[in-house]
Interface confidence: medium
């Protein structure tokens, strides 16, 4: 089970919204807080350790997940071509 603790949005830049989200999760052993289908979720800890972010299935149904080459996060590409980038910190 997960709950969103903080959600900050910055829409000051045209055509770009930056959102910072923090979630708190209660996960089973071997799991850790992550993102599944664009929502906070408990995921296999090995995914986080190896930075194989797309293996969490972080994007919405119908979107394509693409790992950032430096493994700092992932992008979700909508069918229309719009790209949403998520970085992990």
């Amino acid at each position: 089970t997960c709950e969103i603790v903080t959600l900050d949005r910055d829409s000051s830049q045209p055509r770009r919204t930056i959102a910072r989200q923090t979630a708190r999760c209660a996960c089973r052993k071997g799991q850790i807080a992550g993102t599944t289908r664009a929502r906070p979720a408990c995921v296999d800890a090995r995914i986080i350790k190896t930075k194989q972010w797309c293996d969490m299935l972080p994007c919405l149904e119908g979107e394509g997940c693409d790992l950032l080459i430096n493994r700092s996060g992932w992008t979700c590409t909508q069918p229309g071509g719009r790209i949403k980038t998520t970085t992990v910190s």
């Epitope: 190896t50 194989q52 293996d55 394509g64």
Partner: antibody
């Protein structure tokens, strides 16, 4: 069957530029990250660089960083390597590589092209 | 850099083990690539530690123990004679994650 077909190699002049193209078939091209690996004559394999699925993100090996540009056209199922300011040490065979799953690393290549030979000489 | 033996040899039917150690990204695993001649393209025999492409015989397997990865060929055959390269990733603040390969191990089938 997965096929990766490179072209564009040949004799190049030092200081010049080359453009190699890899034409892919047999899989959903836009669902895989792609890369380039090269091999100097009599030497081992060397990482050139990679590009993500959408083409928005790239990374390059230290030997070509600042001189190389990798791009892709998902409609044409092609990935291109442009290498500028050519040096003699760029001589070798250049292989196109396909990543398995969501990403490409030197541990996750599951298909290779036949290679295209590049000779940099005056 | 990745460290692997420069050469190994075996008789047909024997089991061969080729080791590879080092690299900066053991979590991402290792791959093994076979090259039968300097002018031919590499062929993936193992990727991501233990995954085997569908066209690769089951005698090829990969395993990991700590920071060392091992390619095992159980019941080696004459056609397995080749150079085998291992691959992994390294991280540098300058280039980020960049692929690295071992110098290659020449397998001779006696």
């Amino acid at each position: 069957a997965v096929t990766l077909d490179e072209s564009g190699g040949g004799l190049q002049t030092p200081g010049g530029a080359l453009s190699l193209v890899c034409k892919a078939s047999g899989f959903t091209f836009s669902s895989y990250q792609m890369g380039w690996v090269r091999q100097a004559p009599g030497k081992g394999l060397e990482w050139v660089g990679v590009i993500n699925k959408s083409g928005s993100d790239t990374s390059y090996g230290s030997a070509v960083k600042g001189r190389a540009t990798i791009s892709r056209d998902n409609g044409q199922s092609t990935v291109r390597l442009q290498l500028n300011n050519l040096r003699a040490e760029d001589t070798g065979t250049y292989f196109c590589a396909k990543g398995s799953a969501s990403y490409i690393t030197a541990a996750t290549i599951d298909a290779w092209g036949h290679g295209t030979e590049v000779i940099v000489s005056s | 850099a990745l460290t692997q033996p420069s050469s190994v040899s075996a008789n047909p039917g024997e089991t061969v083990k080729i080791t590879c150690s080092g690299g900066g990204s053991s979590g991402y695993g290792y791959g093994w690539y076979q090259q039968k001649s300097p002018s031919s393209a590499p062929l993936t025999v193992i990727y991501w530690n233990d995954k085997r492409p569908s066209d690769i015989p089951s005698r090829f397997s990969g395993s990991k123990s700590g920071s060392t990865h091992t390619l095992t060929i159980t019941g080696v055959q004459a056609e397995d004679e080749a150079v085998y390269f291992c691959g992994n990733d390294d991280y540098s603040s300058d280039s980020g994650y960049v692929g690295v390969f071992g110098a290659g191990t020449t397998l001779t089938v006696l």
